[in-house]
């Protein structure tokens, strides 16, 4: 079965049930429902999933049975619309149920919430978790899927199955260990961090497809797969890009059963043809399905073929450039991107796409000129500043990171971004700046050849978080502009923003800077977030404050927290010393 199966199935639900198996079918339906109805209780979702599963089984037994010929969107949408509290819980989302497919599904998709009002997941004690795991393993794992899916409505569903498998393995191993906590907690931390990263990466893919279209996603995929598989032929890369686009379009569109099925087919195809694709796939292809697909998605770049010819000959020096371009624009540009990317694993994907866009723009202009060859002869010279800009930026920021360390580097970014876009909510600025700051420990350790693809493509993922959060409640024209004008120029657009001179400083509110003894019991990370929240608020009150002024206030604040957390009467200390600190800070900043 290729990814493009066109064989007719009387019953789509039976087809997917048979392809995926009952366990994966149920898990994927649960993910789909939780990603659509993010506020519904777990038990309600489980009930709906069981009803759909029982129905699917009747269709497997007889594909001609009543309603078995309905589309999955119709079946799932009808099921979601049976939820009694839809109007009370979701408000206008209930109006989706008055629509017909495909409008109804589009309506549900539009109501997915990137920042749902849900309580933070608190990790119970290890013994409590192990007991719950042993008492009812199936419910325990379903709960994991449900809690992740509802908080991350664009999480890549087949990949979430892989995370759940690792989650189960962690509990199976560690709940029998002598020191359960020492075994389990690092594994859960790793899964949490990897899960957040996976969610953010997939969110960018969906944004790329939904906001900028299939062509934008395909260009991204051509560049990335050409870097990863530089020995593969262009047609092989093109086939993989077409299939990968189908997989991600399905998952981003809520078609999770089709997506998982097609992803499995794609992994099968890649492994059957690995000799024509990459020498690095051997180990991946020996793994079971979920691990195999994950491994392929993360596989390292293959070695570049030796003696690749110069690109200038055919893309610049040839007199046939315009003829070639006119004959088949997308194929010609696709080949340019493929040829450039396979030669440059040291470039970020977004840089490669900027170069391809510059090349396209030049040909559009020059092929209509009196002397096209003379016009486009220097096009490669235009690439130089585009390449140097991210190189210089990464060099400067890695030097700053090495000088400051992660926490203080995050603080520098908090100040920088709050001054650029002070209208953005404080929690969003803290979350995004903290993530931007993680680029240091993630990428600066790499040699030069790996720094740019690591850093700039990671920054694209983080800035997309800012864009999707801002889109929910837009407050800044500058953010909207950087987010919507060009996908590949988002990072340079944000980098180029200076202090927002139009911003009217926020009124001073002493309550914002009032702290209590509960800060002393927080984890180091939570304590950092509290301090960074205060820092953002300070900048919002005094956007013209200098680095030195802000540093002095933050140092005083750190000393104040440390002092009061050591005091016998912590709450009194926080009340009295806090007042002094606020007064001293106001004086220092001239508030």
């Amino acid at each position: 079965r290729g990814v493009f199966r066109r064989d007719a199935h009387k019953s789509e639900v039976a087809h997917r049930f048979k392809d995926l198996g009952e366990e994966n079918f149920k898990a994927l339906v649960l993910i789909a429902f939780a990603q659509y109805l993010q506020q519904c209780p777990f038990e309600d979702h489980v009930k709906l999933v069981n009803e759909v599963t029982e129905f699917a089984k009747t269709c497997v037994a007889d594909e001609s049975a009543e309603n078995c010929d309905k589309s999955l969107h119709t079946l799932f949408g009808d099921k979601l619309c049976t939820v009694a509290t839809l109007r009370e819980t979701y408000g206008e989302m209930a109006d989706c149920c008055a629509k017909q497919e495909p409008e109804r599904n589009e309506c549900f998709l539009q109501h997915k919430d990137d920042n749902p009002n849900l309580p933070r997941l608190v990790r119970p004690e290890v013994d409590v978790m192990c007991t719950a795991f042993h008492d009812n393993e199936e419910t325990f794992l379903k709960k994991y899927l449900y809690e992740i899916a509802r908080r991350h409505p664009y999480f890549y569903a087949p990949e979430l199955l892989f995370f759940a498998k690792r989650y189960k393995a962690a509990f199976t191993e560690c709940c029998q260990a002598a020191d359960k906590a020492a075994c389990l907690l690092p594994k859960l931390d790793e899964l949490r961090d990897e899960g957040k990263a996976s969610s953010a990466k997939q969110r960018l893919k969906c944004a790329s497809l939904q906001k900028f279209g299939e062509r934008a996603f395909k260009a991204w995929a051509v560049a990335r797969l050409s870097q990863r598989f530089p020995k593969a032929e262009f047609a092989e890369v093109s086939k993989l890009v077409t299939d990968l686009t189908k997989v991600h379009t399905e998952c981003c569109h809520g078609d999770l059963l089709e997506c998982a099925d097609d992803r499995a087919d794609l992994a099968k195809y890649i492994c059957e043809n690995q000799d024509s694709i990459s020498s690095k796939l051997k180990e991946c292809c020996e793994k079971p399905l979920l691990e195999k697909s994950h491994c392929i998605a993360e596989v390292e770049n293959d070695e570049m073929p030796a003696d690749l010819p110069s690109l200038a000959a055919d893309f610049v020096e040839s007199k046939d450039v315009c003829k070639n371009y006119a004959e088949a624009k997308d194929v010609f540009l696709g080949m340019f991107l493929y040829e450039y990317a396979r030669r440059h694993p040291d470039y970020s994907v977004v840089l490669l796409l900027r170069l391809a866009k510059t090349y396209e723009t030049t040909l559009e202009k020059c092929c209509a000129a009196a002397d096209p060859h003379e016009c486009y002869a220097k096009v490669f010279d235009e690439f130089k500043p585009l390449v140097e800009e991210p190189q210089n930026l990464i060099k400067q920021n890695c030097e700053l990171f090495e000088q400051l360390g992660e926490y203080k580097f995050q603080n520098a970014l908090l100040v920088r971004y709050t001054k650029k876009v002070p209208q953005v909510s404080t929690p969003t600025l803290v979350e995004v700046s903290r993530n931007l700051g993680k680029v240091g420990s993630k990428c600066c350790k790499h040699p030069e050849a790996k720094r740019m693809p690591c850093a700039e493509d990671y920054l694209s993922v983080v800035l997309n978080q800012l864009c999707v959060l801002h889109e929910k409640t837009p407050v800044s024209d500058r953010v909207t502009k950087c987010c919507t004008e060009s996908l590949v120029n988002r990072r340079p657009c944000f980098s180029a923003l200076e202090v927002d001179e139009t911003y009217v400083p926020k009124e001073f509110n002493a309550e914002t800077f009032t702290f209590h003894a509960d800060i002393c019991t927080l984890s180091e990370k939570e304590r950092q977030i509290k301090k960074q929240t205060a820092l953002v608020e300070l900048v919002k009150h005094k956007p013209k404050a200098t680095k030195e002024q802000l540093k002095a206030v933050m140092d005083d604040f750190a000393a104040f927290v440390e002092k009061c957390c050591k005091a016998d009467d912590k709450e009194t200390c926080f009340a009295e010393e806090g007042k002094k600190l606020v007064a001293a800070s106001q004086a220092a900043l001239g508030l």
């Epitope: 032929e233 262009f234 047609a235 092989e236 093109s238 086939k239 043809n273 000799d275 024509s276 073929p305 690749l308 010819p309 690109l311 000959a313 055919d314 893309f315 046939d320 003829k323 070639n324 004959e327 088949a328 194929v331 010609f332 696709g334 080949m335 340019f336 493929y338 040829e339």
Partner: nanobody, 125 residues
Amino acid sequence: EVQLLESGGGLVQPGGSLRLSCAASGFTFLTSCMGWFRQAPGKEREGVSSIYTVGGSTFYTNSVKGRFTISRDNSKNTLYLQMNSLRPEDTAVYYCAAGSPARCRLRDPTTFDYWGQGTLVTVSS
């Protein structure tokens, strides 16, 4: 009408060399993919080497890597295959083929759209 005409085949001793040519007419090279395939008696047609007329990237099947070199002259609309260190197992009819770079894959002859009649290469002492 597209025509691909191969030449340069013949009898050669093991360790010897040959240079095959393929003259294309009825279409300009432009953005295309050109390839050499071979078919030994009683065997399936297999890809030997391919080249893009734009970018100039080349691909070879493992058994000929380091021995064969594909090249093209866009101005003459001609494709070449320089074959060195020939072995008896290289004996076959060699075909020139052309197609779209977005489709043509060396391991799959059906992805090439146009074919020549073939030229016989015999490696024997």
